[in-house]
């Protein structure tokens, strides 16, 4: 089965608010989004989804790779079953490590202002609370708390 057959609740990354940390003007932007008023709005929406979708895809890809003998080029997808929230396992994969490395190198400042939103969305997912615990493990394992704080500061000062 392919990736899209899984029930991974990708809607967490299709949030109505493209930029949760923005100023009150964003509320008007969201209203226009819901009405589909402006041509450029969809482009903005896609901009907001881009980084979030990539993280979601990486998470699914790592889970998928557990079901195949070796990793294919471009992280070939072969998904099995439903979303297991196995984020700790996912982070052991080279894909995630490379992704974090990209961000730490400074690409986040201009190209990834959405990462704060990603972390927030991840933290909100799965009401049983297990996902939040895994998020703490993620942050500890990657020594990323300072990185997240940096992202938050970047978000405030370098908003798109």
């Amino acid at each position: 089965r392919s990736l899209q057959d899984t029930e991974e609740k990708s809607r967490s990354f299709s949030a109505s608010q493209a930029d949760p940390l923005s100023d009150p003007d964003q509320m008007n932007e969201d209203k226009r989004h819901s009405q589909g008023t402006f041509t450029s709005d969809y482009s903005k929406y896609l901009d907001s989804r881009r980084a979030q979708d990539f993280v979601q895809w990486l998470m699914n890809t790592k889970r998928n790779r557990n079901n195949i003998a070796k990793r294919h080029d471009e992280f070939e997808r072969h998904a099995e079953g439903t979303f297991t929230s196995d984020v700790s396992s996912y982070l052991e994969g080279q894909a995630a490590k490379e992704f974090i490395a990209w961000l730490v190198k400074g690409r986040g400042r201009r190209d990834f202002p959405e990462e704060v939103a990603i972390v927030e969305e991840l933290g909100r997912r799965h009401a049983d609370g297990s996902f939040s615990d895994e998020m703490n493990t993620i942050l500890d394992n990657l020594a990323a708390r300072d990185f997240i704080n940096w992202l938050i500061q970047t978000k405030i000062t370098d908003r798109k």
Partner: antibody, heavy 119, light 112 residues
């Protein structure tokens, strides 16, 4: 498996209205954005409209903005396209398409329903 | 909108031979932050809807035979069928999903 079945197409006069439906099954409909894409022999494939998983975000191609309205009923796993003030150039096969995890990437398509606008 | 232009419009290739379809975008679809090209390829057989073959320019969708491969970056992309099979006769479309989605005009692949 994922299935998308469109209905509601037909022959209609210019200026009239038509409502297309797309019945979805085989996946958690309420978790995914959905699109309408149309195809004509002359213009090929053309994206028409998008609605987010919860219905809060709706976007339209310039060619249909103000005339078409996309909506969804997650309780019934159904996607809709209300088409008003139809024009001859709206004649096409209309597909509903499921968005993958990646925005604006279409991983499943319905078989399509033909809309013919003619006097 | 980003304009997608495919070449050639039609292509005739002998069974077992290599088929190559090109796609050019009017602006880059490469997202530098993850080094991914937001470019997909679809196959459409007569009377059927399009089927996703490749996304991110070179990643095969699950279940797609490995004779299909995608390459390219930025604005220039290629879909290659390494050894044409009879069932590969179809229309092929490229699509960018970096911005408001747009498609190429299509390439008709036939058997010579």
């Amino acid at each position: 498996q994922v299935q998308l079945v469109e209905s509601g197409g037909g022959v209609v006069q210019p200026g009239r209205s038509l409502r297309l439906s797309c019945a979805a099954s085989g996946f958690t409909f309420s978790s995914y954005g959905m699109h309408w894409v149309r195809q004509t022999p002359g213009k090929g494939l053309e994206w028409v409209a998008f609605i987010s998983y919860d219905g809060n975000n709706k976007y339209y191609a310039d060619s249909v903005k103000g005339r078409f309205t996309i909506s969804r009923d997650n309780s019934k796993n159904t996607l809709f396209l209300q088409m008003n003030s139809l024009r001859a150039e709206d004649t096409a096969v209309y597909y509903c398409a499921k968005e993958s995890i990646l925005a604006a990437l279409f991983d499943y398509w319905g078989q399509g329903t033909l809309v013919t606008v003619s006097s | 909108d980003i304009v997608m232009t495919q070449s050639p419009d039609s292509l005739a290739v002998s069974l077992g031979e290599r088929a190559t379809i090109n796609c050019k975008s009017s602006q880059s679809v490469l997202y530098s932050s993850n080094n991914k090209n937001y470019l997909a390829w679809y196959q459409q057989k007569p009377g059927q809807p399009p089927k996703l073959l490749i996304y991110w320019a070179s990643t095969r969708e699950s279940g797609v035979p490995d004779r299909f491969s995608g390459s390219g970056s930025g604005t220039d992309f290629t879909l290659t069928i390494s050894s044409l099979q009879a069932e590969d006769v179809a229309l092929y479309y490229c699509q960018q999903y970096y911005n408001t989605p747009t498609f190429g005009q299509g390439t008709k692949l036939e058997i010579k």
